[in-house]
């Protein structure tokens, strides 16, 4: 991250490039590859996360049981197109003219096809399930102070409402983070529940994308808690269209 | 009911060093980063310091770094201030504060301090 | 470095309703009331619009955009005081600071 001047820098997206040419002087930060102005007292969406991270230089990089639409990305990472507003556009598109349709938090829900494949609307991702194995500890930790400090986590680090914090499930060493936010509960100035996972993931990863005092510390009773494995999957409002040579 | 209590303050030399202490009582001390913050006479509120729960993690007011040493000891529900060099411009009331918010990215702000302790004056002259 | 901007002082009536704003931070914002100098600090609004248990409802904190508002619907005489508000400076080193401190007088 370079910014224009040293004092101008965007404490919730390392991932930017700010000067102070906003109103009245003040700090203005635009996100590296897209340009777009983001606001630094909240989350930058995926998508132009995504969209800058491909732009920077390249560098080395009770359980629920999730049903047959959950999704998991397997793609990896792409250089998206996102609208005015940073959401992913329906419609995705490689180089060679290889497209494929996307739900909220750009994950490939259709098979790939050519030019002609149209994507009718950006379907929604309601319920997001983070899958984590800690590592080992002296012994499992309790249930309710594990739950209360990964609900304060999202509420206090990511800033999502606790309603959307549906369920912390736990069966040592797997740990259950439910996240569902429905289209009708979004409302305006919500974190989406695709964006506060996006950075939980970066965050386990080692790869926070907040500047100042960056890294997770995570505690349960003053009992480090950490993550060496994560696994999410994503349920859309609308099942996913894959041919059935995909699923054999 | 929360209660920060500091000690430590007093008449001190310039150059010197000093070593503040709050105890801590009313609240689960470990689940809470803590702030030290100064007055000096007739001036403003001037934050010093903070130090995240487990005290993995400081970070202090330019006018301090390098001359400022935050620790906490979790089991006996106290914070600690070490400062040297000490300087004319290090006079002034120390109050211990709690922060509300540990996991915030923004978790340094000033504007999580949910509780204060009474203060202990440092007065630097020689 | 970043400087949280309050206003010197304002001055209301019993039961009328007061407003101090502070700009040039982030997200997290606090009021702190001060009655006389040296003596220890009360939070009035912490973390934006939470308020402490033992401070009375007519104190209230709004958050638009960059700029927090400490609002005091139906002020009172014991109310004057000195009002400090606090944020982040997100400047590198993203440190704690506090405004200058609004001073208000109850006529």
């Known amino acids: 991250h370079t910014a224009a001047q040293d004092n101008c820098t965007c404490p919730t997206n390392k991932m930017t490039v700010c000067s102070p040419d906003g109103p009245g002087g003040r700090c203005q930060c635009r996100a590296l590859g897209s340009g777009v102005a983001v606001d630094c007292s909240t989350l930058t969406s995926k998508c132009l996360l995504l969209k800058a991270r491909m732009s920077a230089p390249k560098n080395a990089r009770t359980l629920v049981r999730p049903n047959e639409h959950a999704l998991v990305d397997n793609d990896g990472l792409y250089d998206p197109d996102c609208d005015p507003e940073g959401r992913f556009k329906a419609r995705q598109c490689n180089q060679t003219s290889v497209c494929w349709c996307v739900n909220s938090v750009g994950v490939r829900r259709t098979d790939k096809g050519d030019l002609s494949l149209r994507c009718d609307e950006l379907v929604r991702t309601h319920h997001i399930l983070i899958d984590l194995r800690h590592r080992p500890t002296a012994g499992a930790f309790n249930h309710s102070d594990l739950d209360a400090e990964l609900r304060r986590l999202f509420r206090e680090r990511y800033r999502l409402h606790p309603k959307f914090v549906a369920a912390v499930h736990y069966e040592q060493p797997t740990i259950q983070i439910e996240l569902r936010q429905n289209t009708s509960q979004k409302a305006a100035g919500d974190v989406d529940i695709g964006d506060a996972a996006y950075y939980f993931e970066r965050d386990v990863k080692g790869e926070s994308l907040f500047q100042g005092r960056g890294g997770l510390d995570l505690r349960v009773r003053g009992e480090p808690l950490q993550v060496e494995r994560t696994l999410i999957y994503y349920l859309d409002e609308i099942p996913p269209k894959f041919s059935m040579k995909r699923l054999t | 009911a929360v209660t920060l209590d500091e000690s430590g303050g007093g008449l001190q030399t310039p150059g010197g060093g000093l070593s503040l202490v709050c105890k801590a009582s009313?609240?689960?001390?470990?689940?809470?980063?803590m702030f030290w913050v100064r007055q000096a006479p007739g001036k403003g509120l001037e934050w010093v310091g903070v130090?995240?729960?487990?005290?993995?993690?400081?970070n202090y007011a330019p006018a301090v770094k390098g001359r400022a040493t935050i620790s906490r000891d979790n089991g006996q529900s106290t914070l600690r201030l070490q400062l040297n060099n000490l300087r004319a411009e290090d006079t002034g009331t120390y109050y211990c504060?709690?922060?509300?918010?540990?996991?915030?990215?923004?978790?340094?702000?000033?504007?999580?301090?949910?509780?204060w302790g009474h203060g202990t004056e440092v007065i630097v002259s020689s | 470095a970043l400087a949280l901007t309050q206003p010197s002082s304002v001055s209301a009536n019993p039961g009328e309703t007061v407003k101090i704003t502070c700009s040039g931070g982030?997200?997290?914002y606090g009021w702190y009331q001060q009655k006389s100098p040296g003596s220890a600090p009360v939070t009035v609004i912490?973390?934006?619009?939470k308020r402490p248990s033992n401070i009375p409802s007519r104190f209230s904190g709004s958050l638009s955009g960059s700029t927090n508002t400490l609002i005091i619907t139906g002020v009172q005489a014991e109310d004057e005081a000195v009002y400090f508000c606090?944020?982040?400076?997100?400047?590198?080193?993203?440190?704690?600071?506090f405004g200058a401190g609004t001073t208000l007088t109850v006529l």
């Open positions: 504060a709690r922060g509300a918010c540990t996991h915030c990215w923004d978790a340094d702000s000033a504007g999580y301090i949910d509780a």
């Open positions: 009313g609240f689960d001390f470990i689940d809470y980063d």
């Open positions: 130090i995240n729960r487990s005290g993995s993690y400081t």
């Open positions: 982030y997200s997290g």
């Open positions: 912490y973390w934006n619009d």
């Open positions: 606090g944020g982040y400076d997100s400047s590198p080193g993203y440190v704690g600071i």
